[in-house]
Structure formats: C-alpha cells, structure tokens
C-alpha cells in the first residue's frame, strides 16, 4: 500500500515522498521514482520562509512612505521585509502596515516612557511636587521649585500644570525672627 | 556527548505488553525525528516505527502495526515504544535511532539518515 | 513496501582488496538510501547517506555511489576493522526498509 506519511522535509504527492524545498525556493517539479524536486531561487523582490512546495514565492512587503513607513530590515530571498515608522510616529499594528504620530502628553500630564517605531507615548499624571505647563511627546513632569534653596518663599503654590511662584521674604519677618 | 539509551526490555509472555523508554541527552531532543529499529537474534536490521519532532506524525511497519504505538514527551528528553499483544517473533533488540537531515546547499535535496543508535535493549517474548 | 536486496549475502576477503557491494530497490528511490556497518553486539554505525554523501568521521576508502534502484557502496582497501555486516536502508518512503545485509569475513 502507499504511503500516507513522510518525514518533515518531504512531502507527498503520487504516493511518492518528495523533499521540500529549501527557505528562498520554489516549486518548479515534483520530484519522480528517479528524479528529485526541482526548485527554483525567489526573485529579487521575493522571498520564502520555510521548507515548502510552494509554487510561487511570496512578494517582500513595501514600506508605503505614503503611510508613513520606511525599510528597517531589507528582505532577503528567506524573510520578509520588515518595516517601521518615520521619526515620530508608530505603528499601528504588530504587523506595521501604517503609522500614527506619537500622542503628546496634555499639560498636567508628563512622559513616562517616550514612543518608539512600535508603541505610543506613555503618559502619567504628574504628582504632588511636580508639574507640566507643556503639550509635548518628550517632556517628564518636573518638580516644583525649590523656594527654600534660593532662600526664598512660596508666593503661589504650584499645581500639577504649573510651578510654584517664589518671592523674596518679608525683611520685616525676617529680623523679627531672628530677635 | 550525544547518547541515546534505552531500558525497559525484559522477557515477558505472548499476549503480554512491555514499554520501552529511550532517554536522550547531549543534543536538543525536541528537534529531531526518532525511530524505533529492531534485531532478531542472529537475523537483519527491521525498521519498527517513526515519530516526527513534535510528535504528531508517527508510522509503523505492517508486522506491528495496531498493537505498537510509539510517543515521545520532549520536555523529558524521553522516546517511547509500548508493545501491546506481544508475540515469539517480536523477540528483538530493540534499539531507538535518531533521524537526522543532511543538507548541503550546493547539493540536490537533502538527505536522510539515522546517524545516532542506542546500545538496544533485549526483549524476549516467550512462555 | 520498497524491497531492498543486498548482494551478495555474505563475502570473504583480504586486508588491502577493494570490495563492492550492491543494493537493489524494487522500485526508484532516487538518492533515499544510506548504508550502515554493523559488528557483533553493536549497534549500527551510519557510513553513508544520500546514496554517495560520507558520514563525517568515517574513512574515505569508503564511498557510495548509485540513484534510482542500483546503488553500491565500495570499500577501496579493507582494512582489518571493516570486517562487519552492511546494510543499506532506503528512506524514500514509510515503511522505510533495509537490505538483509552483508556479511564481510576474512579470508
């Protein structure tokens, strides 16, 4: 009785087991009681992945720029071409097929974790002791002013959008203080 | 060192089962297809059974078929025969073997072989 | 199944002769068969595959030669440790299947 199975690297067709071929080929003929596979580099633009018995290879991805995309790792005749975004955008997905521009982060609001080709901008909340007064994509929430170290006071105390505001120490106060 | 090393063999009763296990060590077990090959005292080498890498494609020849079943556990690094319905005429060396791919890119296809043996291990079905 | 049938079945000869042994397939196999060396209480040692290609390690007085359904495996000048059995093995299709061997003796 023929053959139902084969091993990994064959394939079977007319009861014959025929090798595969390599990643970077095709198909062109199966292989014969005498004749083995016949395969056929990928073009210059193709590629194939795997042992195969594909008969046509698969075209390298484009990295539209119109999208926004640009080449980061050329195909070769056994991988894709694998794309990513222009400065300041990233992709919208795993598979990169088109690009968003990085979110800014409000003010209120400062950069946890800057955006790269792959993943967005990561924004937090900007604590106690700290602010924001900008919209940007790179900027951290930065802490208040340090009235004390200028020796000076806090004339308007500072929000999560805003920095305090120092003024100079009443002198009046200030030698009553020290008497 | 690349070893294959099986154990389980034993005498045992027609009609009766045994499980043989093929440890192996040195090469990265889950990568490769195994096989199972046989020798009857004083007689040739017979081809038992097959299982693919992942353990998903097995094959066996026709004098065991239906009562042999072969299976692997990867994360073990471990191969398995169990023998069921055992018969005088399975009494073997029993060795596992694996198989390996040759590949030369300047050459036509590929090639296979079973380039690592065990040192076997006897079973003996009789009564 | 493909039928493998080794000739001849058992040979005697001398250190230093050159010996050739056949193996026939019952059907084409292309370039699917390798060939073992095999001596008592041993398990088989892989010498050739591919029909022609050597396994590393092993002496090139040996080599394979063949495709199709007539291969041969040639020993260039025996050396006292060839003295075993040889298999050849097809791995074309399942069943995968072996000649009934070769026994190499002294003379």
């Known amino acids: 009785e023929p053959p139902t199975a084969c091993r990994e690297k064959q394939y079977l067709i007319n009861s014959q087991c025929c090798s595969l071929c390599q990643p970077g080929q095709k198909l062109v003929s199966d292989c014969t009681e005498f004749t083995e596979t016949e395969c056929l580099p990928c073009g210059e633009s193709e590629f194939l992945d795997t042992w195969n018995r594909e008969t046509h290879c698969h075209q390298h991805k484009y990295c539209d720029p119109n999208l926004g995309l640009r080449v980061q790792q050329k195909g070769t005749s056994e991988t894709d071409t694998i794309c990513t975004c222009e400065e300041g955008w990233h992709c919208t997905s795993e598979a990169c097929e088109s690009c968003v521009l990085h979110r800014s982060c409000s003010p209120g609001f400062g950069v946890k974790q800057i955006a790269t080709g792959v993943s967005d901008t990561i924004c937090e909340p900007c604590p106690v002791g700290f602010f924001s007064n900008v919209s940007s994509a790179f900027e951290k929430c930065h802490p208040w002013t340090s009235c004390e170290t200028k020796d000076l006071v806090v004339q308007q105390a500072g929000t999560n959008k805003t920095d305090v505001v120092c003024g100079p120490q009443d002198r009046l106060r200030h030698h009553h203080h020290h008497h | 060192e690349v070893q294959l090393l099986e154990s389980g063999g034993g005498l045992v009763r027609p009609g009766g089962s045994l499980r043989l296990s093929c440890a192996a060590s040195?090469?990265?077990?889950?990568?490769?297809?195994m096989n199972w090959v046989r020798q009857a005292p004083g007689k040739g080498l017979e081809w038992v059974s097959y299982?693919?890498?992942?353990?998903?494609?097995?094959d066996y020849a026709d004098s065991v078929k239906g009562r042999f079943t072969v299976s692997r556990d990867n994360s073990k690094n471990l191969l398995y025969l169990q023998m069921n319905s055992l018969r005088a005429e399975d009494t073997a060396v029993y060795y596992c073997?694996?198989?390996?791919?040759?590949?030369?890119?300047?050459?036509?296809?590929?090639?296979?072989?079973?380039?690592?043996w065990g040192q076997g291990t006897m079973v003996t079905v009789s009564s | 199944d493909i039928q493998l049938t080794q000739s001849p079945s058992s040979l005697t000869a001398s250190v230093g002769d050159r010996v050739t042994i056949t193996c026939r397939s019952s059907?084409?196999?292309?370039?699917?068969l390798a060939w073992y060396q095999q001596k008592p209480g041993k398990p088989p040692k892989l010498l050739i595959y591919?029909?022609?290609s050597l396994e590393g390690g092993v002496p090139s007085r040996f080599s394979g030669s063949g495709s199709g359904t007539d291969f041969t495996l040639t020993i260039s000048s025996l050396q006292p440790e060839d003295f075993a059995t040889y298999y050849c093995?097809?791995?074309?299709?399942?069943?995968?299947?072996f000649g009934q061997g070769t026994k190499l003796e002294i003379k």
């Open positions: 591919g029909a022609s």
């Open positions: 040195g090469f990265t077990f889950g990568s490769y297809e």
């Open positions: 299982i693919s890498s992942s353990g998903e494609t097995t």
């Open positions: 059907q084409g196999i292309r370039s699917s």
């Open positions: 093995q097809q791995l074309n299709s399942f069943p995968s299947t």
């Open positions: 073997a694996r198989d390996v791919f040759f590949f030369d890119s300047s050459g036509p296809r590929g090639a296979y072989g079973m380039d690592v």
